[in-house]
């Protein structure tokens, strides 16, 4: 089905539920820009490379971001 699109944001819905970090391939924080007027947090899952959109305002998502960044800082030399 061809489609018409207006703005180039990725997320159709956003979830307040954090994803399991073990299932995570990568986590992107995309700042607002001229293409998309809002911050988007996109979790790419290992299974099928599925992208999941997370609510930047959710407390649980903020905690997930902290946990992931803590994990990354442990790994970096």
């Amino acid at each position: 089905v061809p489609l018409s699109r207006t703005v180039r944001c990725t997320c159709i819905s956003i979830s307040n539920q954090p994803v399991n970090p073990r299932s995570l391939e990568k986590l992107e924080i995309i700042p607002a820009s001229q293409f998309c007027p809002r911050v988007e947090i996109i979790a790419t899952m290992k299974k099928k490379g599925e992208k999941r959109c997370l609510n930047p305002e959710s407390k649980a998502i903020k905690n997930l971001l902290k946990a992931v960044s803590k994990e990354r800082s442990k790994r970096s030399p």
Partner: antibody
Framework: QVQLVESGGGVVQPGRSLRLSCAAS????????IHWVRQAPGKGLEWVAV????????YYADSVKGRFTISRDNSKNTLYLQMNSLRAEDTAVYYC????????????WGQGTLVTVSS | NFMLTQPHSVSESPGKTVTISCTGS????????VQWYQQRPGSSPTTVIY?????PSGVPDRFSGSIDSSSNSASLTISGLKTEDEADYYC??????????FGGGTKLTVL
Amino acid sequence: QVQLVESGGGVVQPGRSLRLSCAASGFTFSNSGIHWVRQAPGKGLEWVAVISYDGSNKYYADSVKGRFTISRDNSKNTLYLQMNSLRAEDTAVYYCARLRDNAEYTDYWGQGTLVTVSS
Amino acid sequence: NFMLTQPHSVSESPGKTVTISCTGSGGSIASNYVQWYQQRPGSSPTTVIYEDNQRPSGVPDRFSGSIDSSSNSASLTISGLKTEDEADYYCQSYDPLPVWVFGGGTKLTVL
């Protein structure tokens, strides 16, 4: 519990306009992309349009592009479908649906509202 | 464009097993999740399978879903058929997300 209730269907002449509404309750409407899906009498399901949770993204099937406009009012938990230049082939039951996507994993459907385009 | 093709109708006797196929064209069916909906006459669709092979709570384990990459198809299998399973069944995937694509639907008759 989750409810999606469509209204605004009816009989309309070809070339005229109609606006459908869908009142949502029982879930976080403002986090959810919502769709319109239609089903012509005796036919299968056809995806029509989707609007993102904040209204900034709208996607349409080619069959309705340029004629239909999807919109939402998050303060009223309501979704709309403005249908212009209606054709006989737009005759269908129109369902408002919260379908599985990249944030939500549960599907909810309204009961549908019938639009008949006939002279 | 990605399309999903289903048989128009299938029929089987109560207690037997039936499989409804959904064949993708114009893309790989395995690259996006497939959902299956059941629609009884006069009712809205309800999900019987999501994410290829997951069952929502309340759907009996007689319903199962699978993907076969080699034939680029998805299948819905219903075992121990009951008369209440008589309905239309639709597969659904993406072209890609956020464009939803439905198969044409299969009418299941339980003889």
